[in-house]
Interface confidence: medium
Amino acid sequence: SIPWNLERITPARYRADEYQPPKGGSLVEVYLLDTSIQSDHREIEGRVMVTDFESVPEEDGTRFHRQASKCDSHGTHLAGVVSGRDAGVAKGAGLRSLRVLNCQGKGTVSGTLIGLEFIRKSQLVQPVGPLVVLLPLAGGYSRVFNAACQRLARAGVVLVTAAGNFRDDACLYSPASAPEVITVGATNAQDQPVTLGTLGTNFGRCVDLFAPGEDIIGASSDCSTCFVSRSGTSQAAAHVAGIAAMMLSAEPELTLAELRQRLIHFSAKDVINEAWFPEDQRVLTPNLVAALPPSTHRAGWQLFCRTVWSAHSGPTRMATAVARCAQDEELLSCSSFSRSGKRRGERIEAQGGKRVCRAHNAFGGEGVYAIARCCLLPQVNCSVHTAPPAGASMGTRVHCHQQGHVLTGCSSHWEVEDLGTHKPPVLRPRGQPNQCVGHREASIHASCCHAPGLECKVKEHGIPAPQEQVIVACEDGWTLTGCSPLPGTSHVLGAYAVDNTCVVRSRDVSTTGSTSKEAVAAVAICCRSRHLVQASQELQ
Amino acid sequence: QEDEDGDYEELVLALRSEEDGLADAPEHGATATFHRCAKDPWRLPGTYVVVLKEETHRSQSERTARRLQAQAARRGYLTKILHVFHHLLPGFLVKMSGDLLELALKLPHVDYIEEDSSVFAQ
């Protein structure tokens, strides 16, 4: 049948006529750093240029025979997945291959670095259209590998990599852990994370999204017309490289930040069976499966946001965790989460001219995560307004007082070790959309932003009895920018955004022996940009 | 995804001495760091990427590489410069004995040194 993977990435409403955006990636050059490839395979013949770059280690073992078809198998298959005539995602994309993996599929960090430099040099010598670099490989965490990827990304190149096949936290591998790289995990036809022998796809906060990666049909190097089924996060990354090529062909001016946000926006949400992931990784791992956008334009005319989790702070008393947005993104809100519930909140800070989200661990806590809400908003200008602890029964409050500034997020931070011992505010003023209200012992931070046509509203959802989870979602046309718990709930573990939904998690009070009857409430700030909507209407 | 984390091993060596009385030795207290892969079987000791500080002029990569070779030779060690980086990161790839790491970390302009390691098709 039509390969399941191509069907999966095609938007449902276009499956009937197998819609593909025009040009099929033809304006984009995809660089593949992998094994050698069989360039005369009918799937890729005429659309692949084998560069003269080769930097590979010797094969291991004295009895190893370099059988051409084996040497080419990995790269040929991936080239076919990216742009193959029959089984490819971006059938119009051109491919350039660099050999950095030997016949056993092994390479070195140094050899790959030299390959990345070769690409940068080529880009400087002969600037072409958008470039996508596919890195279907993984090694241990490498500072230098990640740094090189960062530099190349900042030079305007889109890097896509495999999350790794180690059934492990992708943050322990490179280039998967590089923030500027689009890191792809693998799912199968049942939307299960892919199992590979005793291992499987990597997961965690360093994964950006998942894509088909099991039983993927593609070019086989056994003969020039052969096909083969392969599995792995390389195959998943190849799908995303193909989708990226399609998107960049339709909108060549897209920045890396815009492309990443679109990939996330158009992904299928909440379809992956998370039970496969280790329990502590489920909340950190994005439940997203890549898909092509339903049309090639008008995608840009909405407010795009994504959630970025920090590394874990560690358990020391004064430990902090920092979450950062990408270069072209704006931090619109900051929240925190602790599995033990022991935290001292979070706040937005300036660091090197950029706003970051910092979360604070509390005494006896097992550590915290900072969670940044990172958005794309042209001509945005944000500031943080802070109110120190009020100490009054009404609690602490702060609002956006600058003309034209709207509230995009609320954070609170406290020095006391346990807010639970301090009585919460008895009253929450309502109907004040530009105001953050917090515990009287906490300092409250309002993220206030100005951008053309930006409007925001506050949405609350409360449950009278204690619940382990409360959610509130923004309606269609609105984007979640801020997510925080209603102040005063001492058993709150934290708050975080999942797609367009604000999730507030609490301890199960029945197990803690607490007789607290405190309500749990989630406060979402939903925004939209009238400016972007108008711009879109003018274009149509 | 962050540069700061990852379960990799970091060895920080403080630069304590004025190496060979160099006029442009680093200021007192400056540190360069050494990194290697946390997954032992993937390590490739004997090959190292020497990364220079971001603002380093491109001519410094060759100069630092030559200085390392000269100082190593004075100690009776052979080194081979395998590649000099210009376009992404300032630095160079060198084949040398691990015994020279402390010396290399004391070179002016060095930000960090990373031992080479394996990558694998996924």
Partner: antibody, heavy 118, light 113 residues
Framework: EVQLVESGGGLVQPGGSLRLSCAAS????????MNWVRQAPGKGLDWVST????????NYADSVKGRFIISRDSSKHTLYLQMNSLRAEDTAVYYC???????????WGRGTLVTVSS | DIVMTQSPDSLAVSLGERATINCKSS????????????LGWYQQKPGQPPNLLIY???TRESGVPDRFSGSGSGTDFTLTISSLQAEDVAVYYC?????????FGQGTKLEIK
């Protein structure tokens, strides 16, 4: 030599069970989807079931859904068809067929006859 | 399900003459994304398993004599044997592999006149 060899056919009473096997050789078994196709005496070809290269995905014809189970053992390079609640209309020669990975069958075994009769 | 209908049910052709078998699908098997028709032709000789002749509606499987050719697109397809040989006596089946359940035509029995 590239070949498929079926076994396990025979006479079975209605409501009974049978397990067919197909031993593959000469190609990388794990890389290819595999199928069972049957042919009733004097009749045409009827696709029964398919299983993907990793065994992660299976499909069945409506007529056998819930009664037949396709599986594979990559270490033994063997394809199986567990047939339960057999009916007279399941009587056929059962062929094991290698999938080109597109759904057409580029290698067939010689077949094994299953007769369901009381 | 996609229903495949072959015509004629049987056919007698003289040696050296052209034989033509038609196959019609109840819905298109053309996948627009790669412009391929997901249709194959098989030959089954008495007492033997089927053998793939043609895939993608018109591509000959390796080792198949060039007197066999396939044509057509969408819903209407043809298998042509340009010059019938004695060893071509068999039943011929078309098959769609556009989607599961994969379905075959009822078969066309080809004999020598």
């Amino acid at each position: 030599e590239v070949q498929l060899v079926e076994s396990g056919g025979g006479l079975v009473q209605p409501g009974g069970s049978l397990r067919l096997s197909c031993a593959a050789s000469g190609f990388t078994f794990n890389n290819y989807a595999m199928n069972w196709v049957r042919q009733a005496p004097g009749k045409g070809l009827d696709w029964v079931s398919t299983i993907s290269g990793s065994g992660g995905t299976t499909n069945y014809a409506d007529s056998v859904k819930g009664r037949f189970i396709i599986s594979r053992d990559s270490s033994k390079h063997t394809l199986y068809l567990q047939m339960n609640s057999l009916r007279a209309e399941d009587t056929a020669v059962y062929y094991c067929a290698k999938d080109s990975n597109w759904g057409n069958f580029d290698l067939w075994g010689r077949g094994t006859l299953v007769t369901v009769s009381s | 399900d996609i229903v495949m209908t072959q015509s004629p049910d049987s056919l007698a052709v003289s040696l050296g003459e052209r034989a033509t078998i038609n196959c019609k699908s109840s819905q298109s098997v053309l996948y627009r994304s790669n412009n391929r028709n997901f249709l194959g032709w098989y030959q089954q000789k008495p007492g033997q398993p089927p053998n793939l002749l043609i895939y993608w509606a018109s591509t000959r499987e390796s080792g198949v004599p060039d007197r066999f050719s396939g044509s057509g697109s969408g819903t209407d397809f043809t298998l042509t044997i340009s010059s019938l040989q004695a060893e071509d006596v068999a039943v011929y089946y078309c098959q769609q592999y556009y989607t599961t359940p994969y379905t075959f035509g009822q078969g066309t029995k080809l004999e020598i006149k």
